[in-house]
């Protein structure tokens, strides 16, 4: 008989870079074999990782696999820092890999144009 | 219950290669990561690399241009190649399985001894 | 790649003792290690993950602490049996393992 472990799938040294501002999923890959266990994120503060119980979440289910999802909408530049899912299951708690978000904060690095800009000077895209 | 069982040729002659099988059961490949780990005779452990459930690698950064590890997930095996063996590459040589969150190895092979001489 | 330095390398204590091994790390490895026993003969069985969390079915006098750089493997009441190596070992980056510490019994 195969052993049946819920499982997350986040490797090692996982990082985005991302943009403040934009939208951003992410994604903890999770199996598991019959009910859909408990899972959570956190976010690392210094020797723990802080519940992030209020922020929007949501399940995408695949054949093979399934993603718990943090949802950023937008991300902002205190999003910056890395973050655990965890799971409970038969009262075992299991901890993926830290995943690393650099959020890069557009006001700070080259002014991007507005959208007004862009509409009325479109050579903007390419510069 | 979940085992690991490891196969190999025993002994390699100098700059030839090896190959080691790593069978499974118990689990299923498409579920977790297996590690290899060597031990030298009377010393410590040496992480040679590993293979993911999608079949995506990574190997120990010094040995990287040797090695190579694959996987038939409908076997239940695991396979490491290791090219240009000398001496010191003597040891016994482990496959391992990740725990199901990748952060620790939680069941090993009784290892596969491995001589590399002339 | 991150090196693992575990202190002492030989350990020779009575059975009743208590014993500590220490792991420093390179660099900052969050909680991500774990603790092996290595029996001789025998290939290495987990006992420790995540710094502090005892493995399924291994006795409570084994634990671990630690976070960031420096750790820490206690034995709180040595038993016969526990003769054997001991290794820590980093899982943040690609996994690496101390050089162990062998634990003898008079």
């Known amino acids: 008989k195969e052993s049946c472990d819920v499982q997350l799938y986040i490797k090692r040294q996982s990082e985005h870079s991302i943009l403040a501002g934009d939208p951003f999923e992410l994604e903890c890959p999770v199996k598991y074999c019959a009910n859909r266990p408990h899972v959570t994120w956190c976010k690392l503060n210094g020797t723990t990782c802080v519940k992030l119980e209020d922020r929007q979440t949501s399940w995408k289910e695949e054949k093979n696999i399934s993603f718990f999802i943090l949802h950023f909408e937008p991300v902002l530049p205190n999003d910056n820092g890395s973050y655990r899912c965890s799971a409970n299951f038969q009262s075992n708690l299991i901890e993926s890999h830290s995943t690393t978000l650099y959020v890069t904060d557009v006001k700070s690095a080259s002014e991007r144009p507005s959208k007004d800009e862009m509409a009325s000077r479109p050579w903007l895209l390419y510069r | 219950q979940v085992q690991l069982k490891e196969s190999g040729p025993g002994l390699v002659a100098p700059s030839q290669s090896l190959s080691i099988t790593c069978t499974v059961s118990?689990?299923?490949?498409?579920?977790?990561?297996v590690n290899w780990v060597r031990q030298p005779p009377g010393k410590g452990l040496e992480w040679l690399g590993m293979?993911?459930?999608?079949?995506?690698?990574d190997y120990n950064s010094a040995l990287k241009s040797r090695l190579s590890i694959n996987k038939d997930n409908s076997k239940s095996q695991v396979f490491l190649k290791m090219n240009s063996l000398q001496t010191d590459d003597t040891a016994r040589y482990y496959c391992?399985?990740?725990?199901?969150?990748?952060?620790?190895?939680?069941?090993w092979g009784q290892g596969t001894s491995v001589t590399v001489s002339s | 790649s991150i090196v693992m330095t575990q202190t002492p390398k030989f350990l020779l204590v009575s059975a009743g003792d208590r014993v500590t091994i220490t792991c420093k790390a390179s660099?900052?490895?969050?909680?991500?290690v774990a603790w092996y026993q290595q029996k001789p003969g025998q290939s290495p069985k987990l006992l420790i993950y995540?710094?502090?969390n005892r493995y399924t079915g291994v006795p409570d006098r084994f634990t671990g602490s630690g976070y960031g750089t420096d750790f820490t493997f206690t034995i709180s009441t040595v038993q016969a049996e526990d003769l054997a190596v001991y290794f820590c070992?980093?899982?943040?980056?690609?996994?690496?393992f101390g050089g162990g510490t062998k634990l003898e019994i008079k």
């Open positions: 391992a399985r990740d725990r199901p969150d990748g952060r620790a190895m939680d069941y």
């Open positions: 118990g689990f299923s490949l498409t579920g977790y990561g």
């Open positions: 293979i993911w459930i999608d079949g995506s690698t």
């Open positions: 660099q900052s490895v969050s909680n991500d």
């Open positions: 995540y710094a502090s």
């Open positions: 070992q980093q899982d943040y980056s690609s996994p690496t």
